[in-house]
């Protein structure tokens, strides 16, 4: 029988009974957090042969071997992994051996066997026979091999029963326990599995089979299982399911989901039956079982129980990540924060529709509303008192609503209200009226012309650039001297510049009132000579990089209650010149014959221009005399190098460190101090262990029900 989807056995060992009739676990198997040591000898699940995802064992007291529990577990498919691992054995205090003597294949993922203080028979298993790649295996902090004395069956009686393989240059017997060998198939089978009698299975079998060359006799399938047969691909009108079997449309349509949003059920996409459409796709209608590509970001409807969602911090904005339609009202009240504009854009930038009203008040940290970069419709289904669906009150630093040249925003119902926004020009508000279709809805007091924009230079003239010169890391620009009606009102200029790979930046990108700004700023004093045009040299730039640049005149903003004119330029895009590229990366060379070298490399990290060709130079080197110094047929003549064994937590020093053989010369020698690279590697290793342990704890600990 198929069990699943995923089985979690915790706290009570008697829950193991749930595995009684399982032949395949469709999903994962967790056995964990059983703190009372029990006698597991009466529990045996010989029917279980396949786990389609992963096996996780964590803190199960009293369990000494897995061999009695799962004598016939043959394949762990690793269709979904636990932090890149298909087999995790972690902090199993009493486990003495793994003992999964029928485990022949871990199809995907690596293994992690860590912090099992009593666990032996790890060096006797050749994982390369089970996994495709062993380089990602992590076997650390278990019982030191020296204390284990692992013996394979028959070695004591000098009648060894197990086969030998080479691991790390050690040719040795391979076994799971003191009485179970590791099964190996004849070399004639190649990658194929084999029966107990060493006959080769059908190519579509995986792990083992009950009869040779028969695709209906497989213990598990290499690709897919359908109607008792192992097949390379699912037949027409059937669909892949959970990475291992083929099901028909009716089966897929009748899967019930525990998700509370399950109104539509599973879908069929790209020949697979799956719970949801994959990223970038959406159902073709609410009751459809098929997916179509989304136009732009896929819609995600978010709803606020209390109707109004207050955004007063990055944390509250985080709840809206990925939302494209917000059912309810948005109240934005951002008084302070770090890097607030880009954080808000990250979490709210996909919102396209708000069904209720939008209210922005006391948001002194905001300079612009451009973080709502995809907002195109405010429905106004719910409105504030006075029938307002867009309400902007007392935002001391708000200067821009949106870039109206590139923005289409409709307010379907309700009015707008603006008051006490001293840096927001009334012209910006009037522009919003035009774009949103609300012109004529507002009454006279809804847009206050006295207290909006009274601390801004609102009527802007355009500054024109007169010349630009570039080198590989510099840009020189000049612009027309700006002449306001009274020259004393002009204080200086500010030049803003930043890297801009695309020509789509706006003045307020990444800018907030708390100091965060994605633009670099340089102040430029007025040239003393009235006939000289102001300009600047921008230096320390990157070669072959496009920059966006604009200039603003810094003017006195109030002259006896009249708004005076300011001035700024359009955004200019300018690219620095090309330069010499950095060196090519990861150069590797290998010989594939006596007269050829194959050289490979990766492009430079800083091309500093368009790369057109590479130059490869080579020269003959004299042969290294070291190669002739030893007779490599004589084992004794090879210099011995001793490597650390990499166990963690405990460093045992049992030998005199001064008696080591160093560099081929006998004599007393201290262990070399660790290099910076080694120290860094150890630090990264410790960090990696912590990250995994946090992931494990976060994944498996759930709060007790109230």
């Amino acid at each position: 029988e198929i069990c699943g989807p995923g089985i979690d056995i915790r706290n009570d060992y008697q829950q193991l009974k749930r595995l009684e009739n399982c032949t395949v676990i469709e999903g994962y198997l967790h056995i964990l957090l059983i703190s009372k040591a029990e006698d597991y000898r009466s529990y045996r699940f010989p029917k279980l042969t396949v786990i389609t995802e992963y096996l996780l064992l964590f803190r199960v007291a009293g369990l000494e071997s897995l061999g009695d529990l799962f004598p016939n577990l043959t394949v762990i498919r690793g269709w979904k992994l636990f932090y890149n691992y298909a087999l995790v054995i972690f902090e199993m205090t009493n486990l003495k051996d793994i003992g999964l003597y029928n485990l022949r294949n871990i199809t995907r993922g690596a293994i992690r066997i860590e912090k099992n203080a009593d666990l032996c028979y790890l060096s006797t298993v050749d994982w390369s026979l089970i996994l495709d790649a062993v380089s990602n295996n992590y076997i650390v902090g278990n019982k030191p091999p020296k204390e284990c004395g692992d013996l394979c069956p028959g070695t004591m009686e000098e009648k060894p029963m197990c086969e030998k393989t080479t691991i790390n240059n050690e040719y040795n017997y391979r076994c799971w326990t003191t009485n179970r060998c590791q099964k190996m198939c004849p070399s004639t089978c190649g990658k194929r599995a084999c029966t107990e009698n060493n006959e080769c299975c059908h190519p579509e079998c995986l792990g083992s089979c009950s009869a040779p060359d028969n695709d209906t006799a497989c213990v598990a399938c290499r690709h897919y299982y359908y109607a008792g047969v192992c097949v390379p691909a699912c037949p027409p009108n059937t669909y892949r399911f959970e990475g291992w079997r083929c099901v028909d449309r009716d089966f897929c349509a009748n899967i019930l989901s525990a998700e509370s949003s399950d109104s539509e059920g599973f879908v069929i996409h790209d020949g697979e039956c799956m719970q949801e459409c994959p990223s970038g796709f959406i159902r073709n209608g609410s009751q459809s079982m098929y997916c179509i590509p989304c136009e732009g970001p896929c819609p995600k409807v978010c709803e606020e129980e209390k109707k109004t969602k207050t955004i007063d911090s990055v944390t509250s904005a985080q709840m809206l990540q990925g939302c494209t339609i917000f059912k309810g009202n948005l109240l934005i009240n951002i008084r302070r924060g770090n890097n607030i504009a880009s954080e808000l854009e990250n979490f709210m930038g996909l919102i396209e529709v708000v069904t209720g009203y939008v209210k922005i008040r006391h948001s002194h940290a905001l300079v612009s509303l451009s973080f709502l970069k995809n907002l195109r419709l405010i429905l106004g289904e719910e409105q504030l008192e006075g029938n307002y669906s867009f309400y902007v009150l007392d935002n001391q630093n708000l200067q821009q609503l949106w870039d109206w040249d590139h923005r289409n925003l409709t307010i379907k119902a309700g009015k707008m209200y603006f008051a006490f926004n001293p840096k927001l020009c009334v012209s910006e508000i009037y522009r919003m009226e035009e774009v949103t279709g609300t012109k004529g809805r507002q009454s006279k007091g809804d847009i206050n012309t006295r207290n909006n924009g009274e601390r801004a230079s609102c009527e802007s003239d355009v500054l024109h650039f007169t010349s630009t010169t570039t080198s590989k890391n510099r840009i020189i620009i000049t612009w027309h001297r700006y002449r306001p009606p009274d020259y004393r009102d002009l204080i200086s200029f500010t030049v803003y510049y930043k890297e801009a790979p695309f020509k789509n930046v706006t003045e307020y990108d990444g800018q907030d009132a708390c100091g965060s700004n994605s633009w670099n700023m340089v102040d430029v004093d007025l040239p003393p000579n009235k006939d000289v045009e102001p300009g600047i040299l921008l230096h320390g730039l990157k070669p072959w990089t496009q920059y966006a640049v604009y200039v603003k005149a810094v003017t006195l903003t109030m002259v006896e209650n009249d708004h005076i004119r300011g001035a700024k330029s359009e955004i200019l895009y300018i690219r620095t010149n090309a330069s010499v590229p950095s060196i090519p990366l990861d150069v590797l060379s290998a010989s594939n014959s006596s007269s050829q070298l194959i050289v490979k490399w990766n492009p430079p990290s800083l091309p500093n221009g368009n790369l057109s060709y590479y130059i490869v130079r080579w020269q003959r080197q004299p042969q290294d005399g070291y190669l002739y110094r030893h007779n490599y047929c004589s084992k004794d003549k090879i210099p011995i190098r001793k490597y650390a064994d990499g166990t963690i937590d405990i460093e045992e020093v049992t030998e005199n460190p001064k008696t080591e053989v160093c560099g081929g010369e006998k004599g007393p020698c201290c262990a070399c101090p660790k290099t910076e690279a080694e120290k860094q590697a150890e630090k990264e290793e410790a960090e990696y262990r912590k990250v995994f342990e946090n992931f494990l704890h976060n994944s498996i600990f759930v709060p007790r029900p109230e």
């Epitope: 029988e1 198929i2 069990c3 699943g4 989807p5 995923g6 089985i7 979690d8 749930r18 009739n21 399982c22 469709e26 999903g27 099901v247 089966f251 009748n254 899967i255 019930l256 989901s257 525990a258 998700e259 509370s260 949003s261 399950d262 109104s263 059920g265 599973f266 719970q275 029900p705």
Partner: nanobody, 123 residues
């Protein structure tokens, strides 16, 4: 862990109706697919009906289609089975079961089970 307790069983005449309930404790029921199974005297376990976590989708065995209705009240953590037009062959012990994530049509090994309630249809 999840504890399930069935109630509502009893003796009923052919053609009559009965409503079974299954109360859950230990976890919120809304995060499970819920199902009813039955076991007639001397027979194997038989699937009756199942319902999705939201309660919007359900599935029935052919033998009960049109007569039985499964429903759930997640706020009360309770599953129901309304049985109408009962027949003698509906006599069985009815079990309530719960499974996380999802339940395929061929799944009989649900994660959690109740103790069962006996329904007898006889004149």
């Amino acid at each position: 862990e999840v504890q399930l307790v069935e109630s509502g069983g009893g003796l009923v005449q052919p053609g009559g109706s009965l409503r079974l309930s299954c109360a859950a404790s230990g976890r919120t029921l809304s995060s499970f697919v819920m199902a009813w199974f039955r076991q007639a005297p001397g027979k194997g376990l038989e699937f009756v009906s199942a319902i999705s976590g939201s309660g919007l989708r359900a599935r029935y065995a052919d033998s009960v289609k049109g007569r039985f209705t499964i429903s759930r009240d997640n706020s009360k953590n309770t599953l129901y089975l309304q049985m109408n037009s009962l027949r003698a062959e509906d006599t069985a012990v009815y079990y309530c079961a719960a499974n996380p994530r999802y339940a395929t049509p061929d799944l009989t090994q649900y994660a959690y089970w109740g103790q069962g309630t006996l329904v007898t249809v006889s004149s």
